[in-house]
């Protein structure tokens, strides 16, 4: 008799895109429509929830733009929450100062990506300093990870 078919394990991967109705931090993400992937990872209230310990590549890109540059400091962070830790742990952070000419139209992207050892029940989020300056187009602002 033929051996039973191998049970294929779901690849743990997520790619979420910008959601323009984000009103507060952490950023909220589109998890259903468009170029979205969500497999073996849960999405809950702005966060990606890990359900298996291991090494993961985590990434996020945020596209900032404005019309009359005031050079407000911009920050883009990916951070983690876990019931074991009393406070948020910043995993990656990008900062921009003096990035445009006063009064001019401008646009800047911030990309963060690195490998982390994540534990089951870790929650990952993205924070920005100036929500009003984020362009939420799905190709411009996104958040994701995949298990190595």
């Amino acid at each position: 008799p033929s051996p039973p078919p191998e049970k294929k394990e779901l690849r743990k991967v997520a790619h979420l895109t910008g959601k323009s109705n984000s009103r507060s931090m952490p950023l909220e993400w589109e998890d259903t429509y468009g170029i979205v992937l969500l497999s073996g990872v849960k999405y809950k209230k702005g966060g990606l929830v890990i359900n298996e310990t291991g090494l993961y590549f985590v990434y996020s890109k945020v596209y900032f733009r404005g019309q009359s540059c005031n050079n407000l400091p911009l920050s883009h962070k990916v951070y983690m929450r876990n019931s074991k830790y009393p406070q948020d742990l910043v995993m990656m952070e990008g900062k921009m100062m003096s990035y445009c000419t006063t009064g001019q139209m401008w646009a800047r992207s911030s990309y963060l990506g690195a490998v982390f050892n994540l534990t089951s029940a870790d929650h990952l989020y993205v924070n920005v300093s100036e929500l009003s300056l984020v362009n939420f187009e799905e190709s411009q602002t996104f958040f994701g990870l995949y298990k190595l």
Partner: antibody, heavy 119, light 111 residues
């Protein structure tokens, strides 16, 4: 309520300088750039320049370089514009207006400051 | 600099009728899918008041009888039906690039 309160009318002699002010209230002053606009009978509305309320650096219309100097005092939420070496051509109403970086236009304007240059 | 040419310089419109004001830019004021054209209303002794931004978007609190249209270099402000309180001077302005520039203004009189 958002307000931009400008200083009062000025009657000045030719050749002197004048400094006018624009105090913002009812919003976070450092979130918006401040633009200055000149209105005269001869030239309608002319954009003078813009200042970053956060950093204090400015961009000027080439035509007003050397004529106008913009500054900002974050502690008092006030923007200033000094006009130098005044001539009768500078007689006009000067407006300040705020511009949200995430928007398209100057959404709130001061009431205007009338500057009259006369000997 | 982008030159903004407004027409007509003045017009008189009967109460309840349509007022149409045109503005032509010397080069396109479009960028990345948006038109950086704004319209302001100014009454004597008052500062300009924002009516329309990004060519066709009505500023909060402005009556729906005001509308804007156009893209590239040609833009239009329509007021319909015109009311007594609309007597004012109207200016177009581009915010596509510095220095920002304004049209010469159109004075609207209500007959």
């Amino acid at each position: 309520e958002v307000q931009l309160q400008q200083s009062g009318a000025e009657l000045v002699r030719p050749g002197v300088s004048v400094k006018i002010s624009c105090k913002g209230s009812g919003y976070t002053f450092t979130d918006y750039t401040i633009h200055w606009v000149k209105q005269s009978h001869a030239k309608s509305l002319e954009w003078i320049g813009v200042i970053s309320t956060y950093q204090g650096d400015a961009s000027y219309n080439q035509k007003f370089k050397g004529k106008a100097t913009m500054t900002v005092d974050k502690s008092s939420s006030t923007a200033y514009m000094e006009l130098a070496r005044l001539t009768s051509e500078d007689s006009a109403i000067y407006y300040c207006a705020r511009f949200p970086d995430w928007d398209y236009a100057m959404d709130y304007w001061g009431q205007g400051t009338s500057v009259t240059v006369s000997s | 600099d982008i030159v903004m040419t407004q027409s007509p310089a003045s017009l008189a419109v009967s109460l309840g009728q349509r007022a149409t004001i045109s503005c032509k830019a010397s080069q396109s004021v479009d960028y990345d899918g948006d038109s950086y054209m704004n319209w302001y209303q100014q009454k004597p002794g008052q500062p300009p008041k924002l009516l329309i931004y990004a060519a066709s978007n009505l500023e909060s609190g402005i009556p729906a009888r005001f509308s804007g249209s156009g893209s590239g270099t040609d833009f239009t402000l329509n007021i319909h039906p015109v009311e007594e309180e609309d007597a004012a001077t109207y200016y177009c302005q581009q915010s596509r690039e510095l220095p920002y520039t304004f049209g010469g203004g159109t004075k609207l009189e209500i007959k």
